[in-house]
């Protein structure tokens, strides 16, 4: 059997379990930042012809190892939910990053022949919906 | 996502078995008695972020584009090894009213890791 180790994620109370899985736990420093980026800046303008730019979100901020006060210790009826860090193992530092499974695609119009013909495509996993310390 | 094999220090998924008995939760968790939770570990050098196969690839590519050119605010943004795919797991447990509950708990198992 495995030696006693700290739970890899913050334990959470039953009320946290009941909320939508995609809702990240609030963290003081980890947040989502918006930035307007043009495909020209990226050098993708020969491929992506529309939109010319898009709102890019990224995750930014620090992730302390403290357990927020709204997260109680495991009690009967409080199943583990990785609402907070996913990797709080000895030596592992949580990171402010996009919550897995919540990235969204961007729908774009593309060309591969210099603008003679167009195609509608999706750029996968480009838009960050939620950030969390993971 | 890479599986950690001890030979590389690049971002990978490390096998980790959680025994509910070991962490003192077996008094209220009926089943399973434990499971492979796994976690992410390893380095994220700039050439790794945004590599194809990562579910964060396009997002990481954009950040990397600016980071490698030293542009603010991405210059100091650290790429780190994080779960990119998580899986739910069915659990049977007693709630605080001692009712027996079967529930699919989201995000219990780390399936894949990648560089943010």
């Amino acid at each position: 059997s495995t030696p006693l180790m700290s739970w890899p994620w913050s334990p959470s109370a039953l009320r946290l379990l009941q909320r939508p899985p995609e809702e990240p736990a609030a963290h003081a420093n980890c947040h989502r930042v918006a930035l307007n980026i043009s495909f020209q800046e990226l050098g993708w303008e020969r491929w992506i012809v529309y939109p010319p730019s898009f709102i890019f979100h990224y995750c930014h901020g620090g992730c302390g190892l403290h357990i927020p006060p709204n997260l109680s210790l495991p009690v009967p009826g409080a199943p583990p939910t990785p609402a907070q860090p996913y990797s709080l193992l000895p030596g592992a530092q949580p990171c402010c990053a996009a919550l897995p499974g919540t990235m969204r695609p961007l729908h774009v119009r593309t060309t591969s022949d210099g603008g003679y013909s167009f195609k509608y495509e999706t750029v996968p996993n480009l838009l960050t919906q939620h950030c969390a310390c993971i | 996502g890479l599986e950690c094999d001890g030979k590389v220090n690049i971002c990978c998924k490390k096998q980790f078995f959680v025994s509910f008995k070991d962490i003192g939760w077996n008094d209220w968790i009926i089943a399973p008695s434990g499971y492979h939770a796994n976690y992410c570990e390893g380095e994220c050098p700039s050439h790794i972020a945004g590599t194809s196969g990562s579910s964060l690839s396009f997002h990481s590519t954009v950040i990397n584009h600016y980071r490698m050119r030293g542009h603010s605010p991405f210059a100091n943004l650290k790429s780190c090894c994080v779960p990119t795919k998580l899986r739910p797991m069915s659990m049977l447990y007693y709630d605080d009213g001692q009712n027996i509950i079967k529930k699919d708990i989201q995000n219990m198992i780390v399936e894949e890791c990648g560089c943010s």
Epitope: - | F20, K21, N26, I29, I30, A31, P32, S33, G34, S90, M91, L92, I100, I101, K102
Partner: antibody
Framework: QVQLVQSGAEVKKPGASVKVSCKVS????????ISWVRQAPGKGLEWMGG????????IYAQKFQGRVTMTEDTSTDTAYMELSSLKSEDTAVYYC???????????WGLGTAVTVSS | DIQMTQSPSSVSASVGDRVTITCRAS??????LAWYQQKPGKAPKLLIY???KLETGVPSRFSGSGSGTDFTLTISSLQPEDFANYYC?????????FGGGTKVEIK
Amino acid sequence: QVQLVQSGAEVKKPGASVKVSCKVSGYTFTSSAISWVRQAPGKGLEWMGGIYPGSGHTIYAQKFQGRVTMTEDTSTDTAYMELSSLKSEDTAVYYCAREGDIFVMDVWGLGTAVTVSS
Amino acid sequence: DIQMTQSPSSVSASVGDRVTITCRASMDIRNDLAWYQQKPGKAPKLLIYDASKLETGVPSRFSGSGSGTDFTLTISSLQPEDFANYYCQQAKSFPPTFGGGTKVEIK
């Protein structure tokens, strides 16, 4: 391969108790639950309860609460089901089954016929 | 407890026929449903779990569908060895409950 071997048929008098055994092989005993399901002659299947050797928990259907006891012996990889205060309505075939997933019974024992008659 | 209602209670069919058995749950059980086959004097055998996943070793003529409250077990081309009783069972919540069974007999 995974096997569940049950004890032999029993004939009991009303008011008595019966203890049925289920010896497992082919997998790690503590990794899966054992459910007990009964079937009265010409009737359907009825879940009685389950034992979770890994965690030591037992859960029983309300109908059998107080009358059934499920135990385990991890040294012999054997699960037991004891039913007390037997009535003629308890005449049935009693099956043990492994739970592959929670409440899904993927491998079954051959059954133990229990007859309650005065 | 969740009630499981199977229909029909019996069906007469010939070898090669397509047979459909339905199962209705008294509340939403998503896809937490299993189907079992039981031959006379034998133990039940798991055919399908998670409403549509075929258990290892079960012939592909068996298929399951449905989610929520309405489920179906289909035998695409009935074989002689398929004449048996079939039971659905919900695995969504405690306690697990079985349908009353459907007897598939030779016409």
